[in-house]
């Protein structure tokens, strides 16, 4: 019988007492084969973290700073359940640390030196750790003691709880630096008041502070937020302009064998029986013998943290950067305006080899990072392990939902002004063999299908979106008799046709021979009835243009396109016979890397782009013998986006809506994780 006990870690006598009450009350309402609670008492949260790592306990609830400690080796814990605040309909699991300024003050984030600052309190998250952590490498040296460096950075501050004797500048705006509400500038409201009164130029608070202190929109409009990209936004746009997004209070468990499903089962049942307004007997979110025992008293319930989410992703790049800066205190030798090398994310071995070749030829401008799947690459870019990659539109959507931004678009048509003219897009098509003359768009049921990969535009999102509108369910593996859609569950009929060997079967990378445009077409040639690809795929792989044995004798005339009206047309008539227009592939990165990625890639394409005439003697960025490694092989240049610099603007309303509709069919664990952080 599996052990269904969750050993909860308590850090005080009062917590231990509440834990025992929790245990007893759960016993009374949960059947004997359900989850149960046991209590383990430790002296501190850090002891609890160590106990969980050592398998002496299973769970504890932590604030964000401790979630970071719990994630660090050798603890390796992960977030499994989040407390939420507010209502069930609009649950808040995060708050945003923001920098508030007066509208007419005219400076940006990179111009804070010499300004006057208002902080909630020394060592507090939104008011100190996050802003000072993010500014850390701009502080004057020596940076230790930190308070002295901060005092020398700003021209005056109010940082309640600081030592006013040793660091008088930190108490300049609030004499005495009192560490309680007796100090009018203490806490969130106090720091905002410090700004409002004109004592300070910037207040470091949380996003709700300004709403709690100014009920009137006209009053709020006198203030703005400083964004990390050195712009400003209105105070209600905090989701797009903050210093960090911070989880409020989180249950952590071991990453391996951490009982995360059991912990969720326990807490989900606990909130049903003992949550807000559920029981007089015992209340999960109440602490008669103290404050915030086991869980925050202000919590309204629990939400399961998506399994794909590790602590780094959960805490977010900005928060992790800030805390790491403060803890490790390491900065580049001397901050320069020069761009660091761009770390390109490469999928599997084939891409890595091309990336390494690029890296050598780039003379230090490009470095390479490997991942097994596109989603793993996106996650690495999110957390700073990588910086950039070029993505199909379907993944630009996921990357955008995860906070990344498009910087340059692949262009596929030769034009005089390639780099300045992003194209409207390419066509997603359905290709069949001419010999299968009875096959049309209307009788695909039971046929064998070939897809570039799950989640990609031409190979999945567009055809499956259209199909979904017809069949009104997500069981595409039942619609087709079998197929190859790399990225599908291994036991799915949509992996049956795939050709990868062993663990590589149906993997969404080049280790699966039927992956990508060329792979999906090969799947049609060798096994399938229909392939969902781009309009250039057939001409690029026929007439001897692809020298591989399977392709070298193929003839374009042996293939036709399926049109949505039930007719068929020759391959060259794609403009009048396609499924939809697809946005071109685009390079994505984090917002903080946008300018450098743009600059370095433009340099790189001038060196190794389409202007290189002899690719046998020189490195060519946009060539890989029809394998579309790193970039599509038909890329002519990488073009500026002009104002299409968010994923929504880049992909266009129609495509975003189409992918949004398919979300109910999504198997993307990354998309689930990112929408948890930003619903």
């Amino acid at each position: 019988v599996p052990d269904k006990t969750v050993r909860w870690c308590a850090v005080s006598e009062h917590e231990a007492t509440k834990c025992q009450s929790f245990r007893d009350h759960m016993k009374s309402v949960i059947p004997s084969d359900g989850p149960s609670v046991a209590c383990v008492k430790k002296a501190s949260y850090l002891d609890c973290i160590r106990a969980i790592a050592a398998n002496e306990a299973d769970a504890v609830t932590l604030d964000a700073g401790l979630v970071y400690d719990a994630y660090l080796a050798p603890n390796n814990l992960k977030p499994v359940v989040a407390e939420f605040y507010g209502s069930k309909e609009d649950p808040q699991t995060f708050y945003y640390a923001v920098a508030v300024v007066k509208k007419d003050s005219g400076f940006q984030m990179n111009q804070l030196r010499g300004k006057k600052s208002c902080h909630t309190g020394l060592g507090r998250s939104a008011g100190w750790n996050i802003p000072i952590g993010l500014l850390y490498c701009d502080l004057p040296e020596p940076r230790k003691p930190l308070e002295k460096a901060v005092a020398n950075f700003f021209s005056g501050s109010c940082a309640p709880c600081a030592d006013g004797t040793d660091f008088p500048q930190l108490c300049q705006l609030c004499p005495g630096c009192g560490c309680s509400t007796l100090n009018q500038y203490f806490g969130y409201s106090g720091a905002f008041k410090c700004l409002k009164d004109g004592a300070g130029d910037v207040a470091f608070v949380k996003h709700s502070t300004i709403f709690e202190n100014l009920a009137n929109k006209a009053d709020r409009d006198q203030y703005e937020l400083l964004c990390l990209d050195n712009t400003r936004k209105p105070v209600d746009e905090y989701k797009d302009c903050h210093l960090a997004q911070v989880p409020s209070h989180t249950v952590v468990a071991r990453s391996m064998g951490g009982k995360e499903d059991l912990i969720w089962e326990l807490l989900n049942q606990a909130q049903e029986h003992f949550g807000k307004d559920k029981s007089k007997e015992f209340q999960l979110f109440s602490s008669p013998h103290g404050k915030d025992l086991l869980f925050k008293d202000s919590a309204h319930g629990f939400l399961k943290v998506p399994p794909r989410m590790d602590a780094k992703m959960y805490l977010g790049y900005e928060y992790v950067t800030a805390i790491r800066n403060l803890r490790e205190g390491t900065c580049p030798e001397a901050p320069t305006d020069e761009c660091k090398p761009v770390k390109w994310c490469a999928l599997s071995h084939h891409e890595r080899l091309k990336c390494d070749e690029w890296s050598v030829n780039s003379v230090g401008k490009i470095e390479c990072v490997s991942a097994e799947t596109t989603e793993d690459c996106i996650a690495k870019i999110m957390n700073g392990e990588a910086d950039a990659m070029s993505l199909d539109g379907g993944f630009v959507y996921i990357a955008g939902k995860c906070g990344l931004v498009p910087v340059l678009a692949e262009n596929y048509n030769k034009s005089d002004n390639c780099e300045d003219t992003p194209e409207a897009g390419y066509f997603a098509i359905a290709v069949v063999k001419k010999s299968a003359s009875d096959l049309t768009w209307d009788n695909l049921k039971g046929k064998k299908s070939c897809h570039t990969a799950v989640g990609r535009t031409a190979g999945w999102n567009i055809p499956m979106g259209l199909l979904y509108n017809k069949i009104n369910h997500c069981r595409f593996d039942e619609f087709f008799s079998e197929g190859c859609a790399p990225g599908s569950k291994k036991d799915s009929s949509l992996c049956k046709l795939c050709m990868g060997s062993g663990l590589n079967l149906c993997e969404p990378n080049n280790k699966e021979g039927y992956y990508g445009y060329t792979g999906a077409f090969r799947c049609l040639v060798e096994k399938g009835d229909v392939a969902f690809v781009k309009h250039q795929t057939v001409p690029q792989n026929t007439g001897g243009k692809n020298p591989d044995p399977w392709a070298k004798n193929l003839n374009e005339k042996d293939y036709e396109l399926l049109c949505l009206d039930g007719t068929r047309k020759p391959v060259e008539e794609y403009a009048n016979c396609h499924l939809a227009r697809a946005p071109n592939h685009a390079v994505v990165t984090r917002k903080d890397k946008e300018a450098c990625v743009h600059k370095i890639l433009r340099q790189q394409q001038h060196l190794f782009g389409s202007n290189v005439t002899d690719c046998s003697g020189n490195f060519c960025l946009f060539r890989s013998e029809t394998k579309d490694l790193l970039f599509r092989d038909d890329t002519v240049c990488l073009a500026k986006l002009h104002d299409r610099n968010t994923y929504e603007k880049y992909l266009g309303e129609e495509y975003v809506k189409a992918v949004g509709n398919l979300r109910k069919c999504s198997t993307s664990s990354l998309l689930e994780a990112c929408t948890f952080r930003r619903p």
Epitope: D356, S359, V360, N361, V363, G364
Partner: nanobody, 112 residues
């Protein structure tokens, strides 16, 4: 002007071994890495192995486990140790570093 000279090629039976060397005249050789390519008759030139300045190496899939690339900066030399050679390994082998043109290459023929 740095020049690259490849040597060590020859005729060898399947299963045999060869050690190719790439020597550079001039300084600063391989500071950004060195790549070995090969070109079989009628085929595109393809990357075989590379070594970066920090010692990181990578190989094309078909030679992994059989070929080893190494460097000796003091001697301005990069080697390619090839073992368990197969007929498909036949071709002219070239070494390359950024900003330096290809040399003459060295012919490797694997045949019984």
């Amino acid at each position: 002007q740095v020049q690259l000279v490849e040597s060590g090629g020859g005729l060898v039976q399947p299963g045999g071994s060869l050690r190719l060397s790439c020597v550079a005249s001039g300084s600063g050789f391989g500071i950004n890495g060195v790549i070995w390519y090969r070109q079989a008759p009628g085929k595109q030139r393809e990357l075989v192995a590379l070594i970066k300045s920090d010692g990181y190496t990578n190989y094309r899939e078909s030679v992994k486990g059989r070929f080893t690339i190494s460097r000796d900066d003091a001697k301005n030399t990069v080697w390619l140790q090839m073992s368990a050679l197969e007929p498909e390994d036949t071709g002219v082998y070239y070494c390359k570093t950024p900003g330096v043109p290809f040399g003459q290459g060295t012919q490797v023929t694997v045949s019984s």
